[in-house]
Each structure stands twice: as structure tokens, then as C-alpha cells.
């Protein structure tokens, strides 16, 4: 889904009732530590020498909702995610590097602690390089492992 296109339907008010306290995870993993802003995430990544995983999504996108569920329920992904600085965004940042091939959702982009966007770590869709679907969890897991192999090790 291209985020420049507005969804035709608004959520029913009943959908807005919180089932759990709202956290920065927005449902992507309540046991994980999430950063609040891109700037904070970059700082944490650089100072902790951990890669950053940025998830762009929208509450009103069926594919964001579907990917969120499998991501949150995938034990191996959740465990591996502990080694990342994590950020999920429901808005676009001004950094064009986070949308190398467009502002669609859901998309997942990795950033090295050297603050280099890992444009080389892509999904399986040629028209949306950083998109993942629920059936792509094995590929996402492999890509997370790839992102953990840093471009250069800080001494």
C-alpha cells in the first residue's frame, strides 16, 4: 500500500478500545524495547554499535496488520530483535534514505551503526524491495541475521 493514498474506511470506534496499555511497540512485540523517534534510534544505534531496524506501517493497512501479527508471534524473530535498536513508524520521516524505492507500507529497512542504510538487504518483491508479507518470515529472519553482520566493526 502506498502511504500517499488515504484509506477509504476509518476504523470503527469499537476498534479503538485499548486491549492492553498502549506502548511504543504498537503491537510489534510488547516485550521488546522500542525507541520513540528516528533521531533517538540513530543515536542509540551508533552509541551501542547495534543495527537499527525501522518498520514503516499503518494501522489502516491490512498488510501492516497481518505482518504485525506474524512478527509479534514469531519466537525466533522476537528473540533476534533483542539485538537491534527498534523503531516502528506510522508516519514518514524526512530522511529519503528510509524510502529508497517509495513510501509504501509495510516496509522494513535496516540501518548500520555507521548510519548507513542497508539498501542491499531486500525482500522478495522487485516492485517493492523492502516489503514483507506474512509468508516471508523466514526471509525476514535471514535478513535480520544479515543486518547483524555489521559493515565495519567499531574498535
Amino acid at each position: 500500500k502506498d502511504t500517499t493514498v488515504k484509506s477509504g474506511a476509518k476504523k470503527d470506534p469499537k476498534d479503538s478500545r485499548p486491549k492492553l496499555p498502549q506502548t511504543l511497540s504498537r503491537g510489534w512485540g510488547d516485550q521488546l524495547i522500542w525507541t520513540q523517534t528516528y533521531e533517538e534510534a540513530l543515536y542509540r544505534s551508533k552509541t551501542s554499535n547495534r543495527p537499527l531496524m525501522v518498520i514503516h506501517h499503518l494501522d489502516e493497512c491490512p498488510h501492516s496488520q497481518a505482518l504485525k501479527k506474524v512478527f509479534a508471534e514469531h519466537k525466533e524473530i522476537q528473540k533476534l530483535a533483542e539485538q537491534f535498536v527498534l523503531l516502528n513508524l506510522v508516519y514518514e520521516t524526512t530522511d529519503k534514505h528510509l524510502s529508497p524505492d517509495g513510501q509504501y507500507v509495510p516496509r522494513i529497512v535496516f540501518v548500520d551503526p555507521s548510519l548507513t542504510v542497508r539498501a542491499d538487504i531486500t525482500g522478495r518483491y522487485s516492485n517493492r524491495l523492502y516489503a514483507y508479507e506474512p509468508s516471508d518470515t523466514a526471509l525476514l529472519y535471514d535478513n535480520m541475521k544479515k543486518a547483524l553482520k555489521l559493515l565495519k566493526t567499531e574498535l
Epitope: A66, N127, P134
Partner: antibody
Framework: QVQLVQSGAEVKKPGASVKVSCKTS????????MNWVRQAPGQGLEWIGW????????NYNGKFKDRVTLTADKSTSTVYMELSSLRSEDTAVYFC?????????????WGQGTLVTVSS | EIVLTQSPATLSLSPGERATLSCKAS??????LSWFQQKPGQAPRTLIY???RLVDGIPARFSGSGSGQDFTLTISSLEPEDFAVYYC?????????FGGGTKVEIK
């Protein structure tokens, strides 16, 4: 094998509510989206909404506003669709339809349908 | 909401002939389109998802193609049991929407 078995036909008066059930088996209930779709006599198909049984998250077609409620009972692997303030134009066959086996949104398996007739 | 327009409304063909059904979306829906077959008094049956992926158990004579706004369902050689109504569905955006259907009838 995957099975979706819906409750029987209902006749309701205008203004009343109806609750249709869809009992599932043959797959991990909590990890596939469940959609509800309706079809008025001689008409096409209309999406009502979906629910994720794992946590109860829902999204509804805005057309139904506050009239529809989707719920799931994990203990019996059953989903429910309740429609209130019924009117004659709600007369239709109501279907439950499971999402993809891997949690994807596409509709894979369908229940047999439940006819709801609204008549005074 | 996204509008799906199916054409033709009715297709009159003989067994053994090739059927080509069209579904056009009012905006880009990537490849998030499914096709269903429905016979009178029955629930729909899913044939194709993600525009071109055949559901397990569906005969190979059914195939789907297209992306963006234009999609096609092709039945390479019609069998007697293929005469039915066919619907497309977009699941790119809420609310999911169906096309109006194409009836494939015996000529």
C-alpha cells in the same frame, strides 16, 4: 482438513439483532484472520469485516458503522458476527471466510453460509 | 473505497473454449487480488490469490494474471463444471471490495 461450520438460518424482525456463529477446525484458530462477507438474494458479495482470533483485533467496513460486532472464543475455536438494528435490506446469506494459512489477508476457506431473513 | 469493475457481465461459451474474464480496479492495488467461483446455492470457492497464485486443489486450467489496476482470469479449456459466476476481490485496502461478477454460461 479445514472446516468452517456455520449456525442455522435465522428469521428476525426489523430492529432486532442476530448472532451468527462459525465453528472452525483443522488449523491453528488463533493465527488466521477470519472475515465475514454477505450476499443479498441475487446480488454480489460484500465484505463486512475481519477479526484476528489471537487477540480479538478487528476492522469493520464503515458502511456497517456501529451495527456489527465480531468476536472470537478461543476455547471453542468459534467466531461470531452480531448485527444489530436489523432492517429488511440486511436479508442475506452471511459467510465466514478464513484468511490465508500463514496469516495473510486473502480469503482461503469459506463456511457454508447462514441465511438471515429480516421480515415483519 | 476501491471499485472493481468486472467485464463482461455475461460470457456465453461452449465446453472446450477458452474463457477470459477481466477485473479493473479504480486505483493501484499492487497484486492483492483474488478470484472466486460461485455456483447457485453454494459458498464461493477461492481459485486464485495474489493475482496469479493458484490455490491448492484448483485445476491448472485456471490461471490469473495482471498487477496494478488490470487483472485477468483465464480458463484455458472450459469443463462443464466451470459454468458459474466468478468474482474478483481486492484486499489491498480496507474495506475489501468485490467486483460485480461475471456469469459464464453455456452457449
Amino acid at each position: 482438513q479445514v472446516q468452517l461450520v456455520q449456525s442455522g438460518a435465522e428469521v428476525k424482525k426489523p430492529g432486532a439483532s442476530v448472532k451468527v456463529s462459525c465453528k472452525t477446525s483443522g488449523y491453528v484458530f488463533s493465527r488466521s484472520w477470519m472475515n465475514w462477507v454477505r450476499q443479498a438474494p441475487g446480488q454480489g458479495l460484500e465484505w463486512i469485516g475481519w477479526i484476528y482470533p489471537g487477540d480479538g483485533d478487528t476492522n469493520y467496513n464503515g458502511k456497517f458503522k456501529d451495527r456489527v460486532t465480531l468476536t472470537a472464543d478461543k476455547s471453542t475455536s468459534t467466531v461470531y458476527m452480531e448485527l444489530s438494528s436489523l432492517r429488511s435490506e440486511d436479508t442475506a446469506v452471511y459467510f465466514c471466510a478464513r484468511g490465508g494459512y500463514d496469516g495473510s489477508p486473502w480469503l482461503s476457506y469459506w463456511g457454508q453460509g447462514t441465511l438471515v431473513t429480516v421480515s415483519s | 473505497e476501491i471499485v472493481l469493475t468486472q467485464s463482461p457481465a455475461t460470457l456465453s461459451l461452449s465446453p472446450g473454449e477458452r474463457a477470459t474474464l477481466s477485473c479493473k480496479a479504480s486505483q493501484d492495488i499492487n497484486s492483492y487480488l483474488s478470484w472466486f467461483q460461485q455456483k447457485p446455492g453454494q459458498a464461493p470457492r477461492t481459485l486464485i490469490y495474489r493475482a496469479n497464485r493458484l490455490v491448492d486443489g484448483i485445476p491448472a486450467r485456471f490461471s490469473g494474471s495482471g498487477s496494478g489496476q488490470d487483472f485477468t482470469l483465464t480458463i484455458s479449456s472450459l469443463e462443464p463444471e466451470d459454468f458459474a459466476v466468478y468474482y474478483c476481490l481486492q484486499y489491498d485496502e480496507f474495506p475489501f471490495t468485490f467486483g460485480g461478477g461475471t456469469k459464464v454460461e453455456i452457449k
